[in-house]
Every structure is written in C-alpha cells, then in structure tokens.
C-alpha cells in the first residue's frame, strides 16, 4: 500500500512539475524591467525565451519574437535547449510511468517490468528536473551579471546634460515557476525511484517468519512489513502528472531489486 501511494504521489508530483516546466518555458516573464531606479516609467519591458514584450501604460502590449537563431546569445540558446530537453524527458517519463503504475494492468506485465519502468521514469524525472533547474539558474546568473554591468554603466550621455537611463532587468515570474517546477519534478522522480524498490519481486531469502494458511503463503519481513504476496494482486495506485523538466545529468545510485529496506 505504501509503495503504491509513493508511486502514485511521485507520479502526481512529477506531473505538476512537468506542467510547471512547460508553463515556465512558454512564459514571457523570464526577465522583467527593474523599476527601482526608474519607478516613473510609462513603458514596461519584459522578456522570455522566445520573445520580448513591451507593455505601455495605455494598456497596449507588443511582443516580438526572436526570429533569428544565429544572432541570439549562446546562453539563451543553452537555456532553451535545457528546458526543451527537460520537457521531452519529463514527457517520456510520464508516458513510461503511466504504464508502470500498479493500478494499471497491461496484459501479463510482471512486477519486475513495472519496477524497471518505475525506475526508468524516476530517473527521467530526476534528469528532467535538473535540466529545468539548471536552465533557470543559468538564465538567472546571466541576469545578475548583466544587472551589475548595467548598474556600473547606469547613465550615459553627452557632458552629463542629456541622460539616457539604461534599462536593467531583474528576475521574472518564470524563473520562480521554473525553480519550483524543477524541484517538484526532481522530488517526484526520487519518489518513483523509492517506489521502484518496493515494487520489485523479492529474489533473496531473508530470515523471515513464514505463515502458511489455506494454500497461499504470505512472507513477512521482520517488522511486519508486507514485502510480497503470492501472485501479486496489484493494489490500486493512482497518480496525477505534474509537469517538470530536469536539468543536467545527475549521478544517481539506483536501487536494485535486491535492495529492500
């Protein structure tokens, strides 16, 4: 029951995380104009991974896509790549995890296969979450660097007579959405990996008390935790998917099917 709950919860959390990663990737507010030094501006600028927007006090908003590919900063391209990889891995992970859910029966799929699929999806979620966190963090670092560079060069002009206020950008809502979503996907992935350990059929004999009752045996591990049942009636496990993207590879020691807690 606990394994099913862990698997289901992991799926739901990952689903929410991946949805968040997709949302963050599509959002225009990755960076927003810093109004601290120019609170009286009637024009508000904000930028996303795919386009930049200007909102006027008049209520009109104009967005322009980045129609060039080669002319964009390498860092922006890298962030785009990380987020897309995160989304793709997360989506594949979700697909795999749906079939791995204990509550879903597909033909005569064995528990070992479900365990492997759960582990695979868990790893995918972890990598997906790391990709998202890395992507958002790279963008945030880029913003911080640019912010201080523009602060050092805040006002330019001829002889100090004419001032040109340089537009500075600070963290937009998408960054926070991305960090949270990446974290959720990561957590969901870890939960899936943990659930995998409980799903795998036991192959090693442990010192355990065996109770024989009416032709079907139930082995209990010390501590009263039900490790396996005869022909495995799968308890229902439901998971909702949470969108999440992972960033970068993570060294992960995966539980083997012999690793029982």
């Amino acid at each position: 029951m606990a394994v099913t709950a862990c698997q289901g919860l992991g799926f739901v959390v990952s689903l929410i995380g991946i949805a968040g990663i997709i949302a963050a990737t599509c959002m225009d507010q990755w960076s927003t104009q810093d109004l601290y030094n120019n609170p009286v501006t009637a024009v508000f600028n904000y930028q996303g991974l795919w386009r930049s927007c200007v909102r006027e006090s008049s209520g009109f908003t104009e967005c322009r896509g980045y129609f060039t590919l080669l002319g964009l900063p390498a860092m922006l391209q890298a962030v785009r790549a990380l987020m897309i990889v995160g989304i793709v891995l997360g989506a594949i992970g979700l697909l795999v995890s749906i079939f791995a859910l204990k509550c879903i029966r597909i033909g005569s799929m064995e528990d070992s296969a479900k365990a492997n699929m759960t582990l695979t999806s868990g790893i995918m979620f972890i990598v997906s979450g790391l990709c998202a966190i890395a992507g958002v963090s790279v963008f945030a670092n880029m913003l911080v660097t640019n912010f201080w560079m523009s602060t050092a060069n805040m006002y330019t002009g001829m002889g100090g007579m004419v001032q040109t206020v340089q537009t500075r950008y600070t963290f937009g809502a998408a960054l926070f959405v991305g960090w949270v979503a990446g974290g959720l996907t990561l957590i969901g992935g870890v939960m899936m990996c943990i659930a995998c350990r409980g799903l795998a059929p036991e192959e090693t004999n442990y010192k355990a008390v065996s109770y024989h009752a009416s032709g079907h045996s139930v082995a209990y591990k010390p501590g009263g935790f039900k490790a396996s049942t005869g022909f495995g009636s799968n308890t229902k496990n439901k998971k909702i998917y949470d969108g999440g993207a992972r960033t970068e590879d993570e060294v992960q020691s995966y539980p083997s099917k012999h690793d029982y807690v």
Epitope: Q33, V43, Y46, E56
Partner: antibody, heavy 118, light 113 residues
Framework: QVQLQQSGAELVKPGASVKLSCKAS????????INWVRQRPEQGLEWIGW????????KYNEKFKGKATLTTDKSSSTAYMQISSLTSEDSAVYFC???????????WGQGTLVTVSA | DIVMTQSPSSLAVTAGEKVTMTCKSS????????????LTWYQQRPGQPPKLLLY???TRESGVPDRFTGSGSGTDFALTITSVQAEDLAVYYC?????????FGSGTKLEIK
C-alpha cells in the same frame, strides 16, 4: 465613431469644487484609459492624470495630487474629474482624451472651460 | 520631470513651402525593449482640442495627411510638413510619453503668410 463628450462651461467661486464629466461612446469604455489635460489661457498643455475604467487604476501627475480626483461610472461610460479648492490658477480648459498606442492621446473631448472668479 | 523644448516658438511660411520644427527632450525617450521613441506630435487649431498627428515619433495616425513626417531618436526630434496648406495653421505640440509625468513642449505656432 469614437467620441468624448464633455460637460459645459463652469463658473465657480474660489475655494469651491467642481466636477467635470466626459461621456465616451463608439468604443468599449472599460478597455481604454482616459487622460485629463489642462490648458490655461494662452498657455501650453499639462497632463493631470489617467484612469482605467476597467480596473479603476489611476495615475496622477504629482503636481495635481490632492487637487484633482479621477473617477468613472462604467454603467454610463462616463469619466469624471473633481477639482477641489479652486483658485484663479485653476481657470483653464480641461480636456479628456482616450489612451492610444505609444501612450499617446487620441479622440479628445471638446474641452470644458472652468472659470474661477469671486 | 522630462523637459520638452520646442523651437522655434513661432514661424510664418507661405502655402506650399516646406517647414520643419524641432523638439528636444532632457532625457532619452528611446525604449530599448522595442527600439521605439515615446514621443507624440499634436496639432491644435484655434478653438479646437489637440489632434493626434504622430506617435512613436514617426508613426502617422490614420487620416493624417502624408505631408506630415516625424523623425529623430533619443532626445532630438523633428516634425516636417512638406507642403504647408492653409488648414495647417495651428500650434504644434510634442509630448513625452515615456516617463511620468507626461510632459508637453511649449508649442510651435505655425502661421501662414
């Protein structure tokens, strides 16, 4: 077509208040902000502030804070500006105008002449 | 506040002539986000409310004759009327639409000889 119809001329005493109206027609009133502009006799234009009927957000020129109060009535598609503690300095033509691209003002009202005199 | 300085304060031309008036702002009106200058030109004929001519420094409002042309960027702007007509007799104002408070120039009065 878009029209802004302003109330008639006002003759008021110093220290009194006056409420000017600007009735909009020909467009969705809640979609666009309404600006108010003052023009003193033989002088230039001064921006007083704007109000968005949709969400009620208001922005004032610091110079007119406490002097002008902007409100709207969505049911009648009318914007109002109340000017308080009137002095001879407030004698002017007051215009309302709809916000447009580039924060510009389009579709101006015909103006309301306010004369402050004892 | 941004100060808008218009020159000349008045000018008299004969019909058909080309006329240029300038507007200078104390701060740049160029927005880096969309590379547009938040400067507007208005025409105010005697006894009438102002009429929008150009926004974003050079974008002509619909219905405005193409003899009106806006130019400039940053802090220096100009309004050119290529062939002045009798109905162009008016005061022309430039306006800062970039930062609050929105400020107007003192105007350039165009007279027809």
């Amino acid at each position: 077509q878009v029209q802004l119809q302003q109330s008639g001329a006002e003759l008021v005493k110093p220290g009194a208040s006056v409420k000017l109206s600007c009735k909009a027609s020909g467009y969705t009133f809640t979609t666009f902000g309404i600006n108010w502009v003052r023009q003193r006799p033989e002088q230039g234009l001064e921006w007083i502030g704007w109000i968005f009927p949709g969400d009620g957000s208001i922005k004032y020129n610091e110079k007119f804070k406490g002097k002008a109060t902007l409100t709207t009535d969505k049911s009648s598609s009318t914007a109002y500006m109340q000017i308080s503690s009137l002095t001879s300095e407030d004698s002017a033509v007051y215009f309302c105008a709809r916000f447009y691209y580039g924060n510009s003002f389009v579709s101006w009202g015909q103006g309301t002449l306010v004369t402050v005199s004892a | 506040d941004i100060v808008m300085t218009q020159s000349p304060s008045s000018l008299a031309v004969t019909a058909g002539e080309k006329v240029t008036m300038t507007c200078k702002s104390s701060q740049s009106l160029l927005n880096s986000g969309n590379q547009k200058n938040y400067l507007t030109w208005y025409q105010q004929r005697p006894g009438q409310p102002p009429k929008l001519l150009l926004y974003w420094a050079s974008t002509r409002e619909s219905g405005v004759p193409d003899r009106f042309t806006g130019s400039g960027s940053g802090t220096d702007f100009a309004l050119t009327i290529t062939s002045v007509q009798a109905e162009d007799l008016a005061v022309y104002y430039c306006q800062n639409d970039y930062t609050y408070p929105f400020t107007f120039g003192s105007g350039t009065k165009l007279e027809i000889k």
